[in-house]
């Protein structure tokens, strides 16, 4: 079965430095996204081999791509304090199929010290259902990753 | 659960402008992907745009790009379509939809409008 293999689990860095993150499969994708997850999960890049990339305007300009989509590092600079959470790639396949995620902790730079990554890697559980009647979905179990979804067509 | 209604649409000039609304009632409007999608007489319903569900990625079908702008208002639950220099071959019932969580490029639709009308003709 295909299977995306993500590192790092998670690092600390300063505001305004860079991180990269490696997405990699045994290929058979027709392209790759890479999700923040949060209380509203979100695609912020997507990536295809031959085509233009496609990044969020919060990221525009900070991100860069080396590699295919099969082998993919992305490197986002100038990090913010916002931009702290756990990034997860998603290879669309007949299947789609996600990484294990990883933990980016911005810090203040004075602060390093009492913000550490653990050797264990992010958490995966499930993404919200989607919301019923009035209820908003509970963001404590919306920063895990979600069940692969069933095959989703090309527009 | 979304439901979808969709406005803005009717009869226009080639090389006219029209601006499409689709507003969506029901919660966490902020957590789908939504798109646009059409449907001329005897043909198959055809992609247009989708957009992020921050708004901050867009993708477009080679057709209308450069042509059309989508854009949303997440405090107005509110996902719009600008057109712009419309020509014969964009008539067609432009149906507005949603996917929870959605992808941009390879977006499904979990909930669908029920279209408006929109015809380019002299």
């Known amino acids: 079965a295909q299977e995306v293999q993500q590192s790092p689990h998670c690092t600390t860095v300063p505001v305004g430095a860079s991180v990269n993150i490696t997405c990699s499969t045994s290929g058979g994708l027709r392209g790759i996204y890479l999700r923040q997850l949060g209380p509203q999960p979100q695609d912020i890049i997507y990536y295809e081999d031959g085509v233009v990339p496609t990044t969020d305007r919060r990221f525009r300009g900070r991100i860069d791509f080396s590699g295919s989509q099969d082998n993919l590092t992305i490197t986002m600079h100038r990090l913010q304090l916002s931009d702290t959470g756990t990034y997860t790639c998603q290879a669309i396949t007949e299947v789609n199929v996600y990484g294990s995620g990883t933990l980016v902790l911005v810090t203040e730079e004075q602060s390093q010290g009492w913000h550490r990554c653990s050797d264990a890697p992010p958490r995966a559980s499930a993404l919200p259902a989607p919301p019923t009647g009035s209820a908003l979905p509970d963001p404590q179990t919306a920063s895990a990753l979600p069940d692969p979804p069933a095959a989703s067509a090309l527009p | 659960q979304v439901q979808l209604q969709e406005s803005g649409g009717g009869l226009v000039q080639p090389g006219g402008s029209l601006r499409l609304s689709c507003t969506a009632s029901g919660r966490a409007f902020s957590m789908y992907v939504m798109g646009w999608f059409r449907q001329a007489p005897g043909k198959e319903r055809e992609f247009v745009s989708t957009i992020s569900a921050s708004g901050g990625m867009t993708y477009y079908a080679d057709s209308v790009k450069g042509r059309f702008t989508i854009s949303r208002d997440n405090a107005k639950n509110t996902v719009y379509l600008e057109m712009n220099s419309l020509k014969p071959e964009d008539t067609a019932v432009y149906y507005c939809?949603?996917?929870?969580?959605?992808?941009?490029?390879?977006?499904?639709?979990?909930?669908w409008g029920k279209g408006t009308q929109v015809t380019v003709s002299s």
């Open positions: 939809a949603a996917e929870y969580l959605g992808n941009l490029r390879h977006f499904r639709g979990d909930h």
